[in-house]
């Protein structure tokens, strides 16, 4: 009966050697792909000289296989019923799933110029930077290959800076041969309703990036949730990519390869301004760019990125306020393509399919003392790329799941 199934499920979703959950948790059996679309700037000179709207044209997908490496340093702690681990990063380019090669060129914002002018706001330092920008023949925009843009390149301007700075720049640099964590999560042995919920991240229960409740590490890493998920639940999870915890709400029932799953989506409310969603007050970290915390749909994660002015949003500024996208031409947000969803099998709490979508933007501001930014009349949150990370349970695994889990219940 139901009790027996519940008992079996509770046993099999515990994160310890010998369970179905553990095997799939250590190394995902699902192929995960990360597709990138790069925003190629069409009018760099007009923007730099006249502060025109930035005309972008997305190019992609450029696809990489990710999350294929097993978790490392997996250590059980019997005392507090947790398991700790590192999640290694790796990306392999998939030419057959891409529109071009890693050598394709793109005109994008000069990451180093935008970041340095933001980090060093002292006018004297900006004048020093200006002379180095000019000397290195750098400008507001640059042409970079996909490989350089994503994984790193030696910046000619930063290479001239006479004090210690990292001279390699890339949106995901460093990535290969690095790991995310240490994560310490509850293994569920003593309390199955806590399974996979993060206890600490990098040894702390808070992030130190935000004020108040915004700084909390809530829920799981979204790969799974405690079993017996209800449609009424708000599923909390932490995403290190966006340096914050977020949540998903039930949207619809979906049939995935014969398995009934619940589709949970990130609601627009999660991206709302504190005016609309007061809970979000602590994600508003400054008053100028956010227009006194009335702008919405972009998240300033500079504190999490060594002061670099990185803003995270949904692709094409989906769910963002008009003032954010107004200076950018060529964006076409739509929910179907650009929102994030998780398809969760409710009995086990396993995420059997997901699409995580986000956009990486960089703030660039006018600067009196930096020639290449001198003619700007306004701030721009410049889209650099958006990504779609997807994973779907394989046919074989789906069959196994149907026979061992959902089939037994039905």
């Amino acid at each position: 009966g139901d009790l027996l199934i519940q008992k079996t499920i509770k046993k099999q979703v515990v994160l310890e050697e010998g369970t179905i959950a553990f095997k799939n948790w250590v190394k995902t059996g699902t192929e995960v792909y990360r597709q990138f679309w790069i925003f190629d700037v069409q009018n760099p000179q007009e923007v730099m000289m006249n502060s025109s709207n930035i005309q972008v044209k997305q190019r992609g997908p450029y696809t990489y296989r990710v999350r294929f490496l097993a978790k490392e340093n997996v250590t059980q702690d019997a005392e507090d019923n947790t398991v700790s681990f590192l999640q290694p990063n790796g990306a392999i380019f998939e030419p057959s799933l891409s529109v071009g090669t890693e050598a394709d060129n793109f005109t994008v914002l000069n990451l180093a110029v935008a970041a340095a002018s933001h980090i060093y706001q002292n006018q004297f330092v900006q004048m020093i930077l200006n002379s180095l920008i000019n000397k290195s023949k750098s400008s507001m925009f640059q042409v970079r290959t996909l490989r350089e843009l994503l994984w790193g390149y030696r910046d000619p301007f930063l290479s001239l800076v006479p004090y210690p700075v990292t001279t390699t720049v890339g949106l995901f640099y460093p990535y290969n041969n690095t790991a995310d964590g240490v994560y310490k999560v509850f293994n569920g042995k003593d309390n199955i309703s806590k399974v996979a919920i993060i206890d600490t991240y990098k040894g702390k229960r808070n992030l130190s990036y935000w004020e108040s409740h915004c700084d909390m590490i809530n829920g799981t890493d979204a790969a799974s949730f405690p079993p017996f998920v209800e449609k009424s639940q708000v599923l909390q999870f932490f995403s290190s990519d966006i340096c914050r915890s977020i949540y998903a709400v039930f949207e619809s029932d979906v049939n995935l390869k014969g398995i009934p799953v619940y589709r949970f989506v990130l609601p627009s409310k999660a991206f709302a301004s504190p005016v609309e969603n007061p809970d979000n007050y602590c994600f508003c970290t400054e008053k100028i760019i956010s227009k006194n915390c009335t702008s919405y749909g972009v998240l300033d994660i500079s504190k999490c990125k060594e002061g670099r002015p990185v803003y995270i949003s949904l692709p094409h500024f989906l769910y963002a306020s008009p003032d954010v996208s107004e200076p950018i031409d060529g964006l076409n947000p739509n929910e179907e393509e650009h929102r994030t969803y998780l398809d969760i099998e409710p009995i086990t709490g396993f995420t059997l399919q997901f699409a995580k979508r986000l956009q990486v933007n960089l703030l660039v501001k006018p600067s009196e003392k930096i020639q290449v930014l001198k003619n700007l009349k306004r701030n721009y949150i410049v889209p650099i790329l958006w990504l779609n990370e997807t994973g779907t349970i394989g046919d074989e695994k789906a069959n196994m799941f149907r026979s061992q889990v959902t089939g037994k219940i039905n």
Epitope: N122, S131, Y163
Partner: antibody, heavy 118, light 107 residues
């Protein structure tokens, strides 16, 4: 109140070196650029260079490269300028001057007279 | 390097008169010009900063104008306490450069 207190007058021999100090108070030392300015007797002002204590970034007027070295001691909120291989041409009043946000040379020290004489 | 040519080198004016000092730069510096007053035995004092901005506490008889390469500093209704040397400073680029100075005396 922001104050810049410079060290006293110096009488030095040709070929020698001298190190002038500028002790600051009443502000966050690391956040503002400290400049040094030369004024020869009866002449105009010349910018020697500046230092941003926060990260040690310095920039010199080409004319004073090799002549002046700017340093800071954050623990005592003091800026220093060392002048080397002194000649009579280096006899002058030297000022330290501090910026205020986006305002150049908003605060000045009282000046240090350096006299180079055999 | 931007050179700054200041004129006149000296001038003698009567109390109550209007004083005009000019600085011309060798490159376009937008409105990045500053003006300083130096009285004998004292360090210079900032009167007007970039963008022709009168500093707090500075009397309104002092003003400046100009953009690009041509800049003018004005004292309306000269007072005896205005006897000093006056310097302009361009702050558009490094090295920062001063004008040669103007010695103002009372007739």
């Amino acid at each position: 109140e922001v104050q810049l207190q410079q060290s006293g007058p110096e009488l030095v021999k040709p070929g020698a070196s001298v190190k002038i100090s500028c002790e600051t108070s009443g502000h966050t030392f690391t956040e503002y650029t400290m400049h040094w300015v030369k004024q020869s007797h009866g002449k105009s002002l010349e910018w020697i260079g500046g230092i941003y204590p926060n990260n040690g970034a310095t920039k010199y007027n080409q004319k004073f490269k090799g002549k002046a070295t700017l340093t800071v001691d954050k623990s005592s909120s003091t800026a220093y300028m060392e002048l080397r291989s002194l000649t009579s041409e280096d006899s002058a009043v030297y000022y330290c001057a501090r910026d205020r946000y986006d305002v150049w040379f908003a605060y000045w020290g009282q000046g240090t007279l350096v006299t180079v004489s055999a | 390097e931007t050179t700054v040519t200041q004129s006149p080198a000296s001038l003698s004016m009567a109390i109550g008169e209007k004083v005009t000092i000019r600085c011309i730069t060798s490159t376009d510096i937008d409105d990045d010009m500053n003006w300083y007053q130096q009285k004998p035995g004292e360090p210079p004092k900032l009167l007007i900063s970039e963008g022709n901005t009168l500093r707090p506490g500075v009397p309104s008889r002092f003003s400046s104008s100009g953009y690009g390469t041509d800049f003018v500093f004005t004292i309306e209704n000269l007072l005896s306490e205005d006897v000093a040397d006056y310097y302009c400073l361009q702050s558009d680029n490094l090295p920062l450069t001063f004008g040669g100075g103007t010695k103002l005396e009372i007739k």
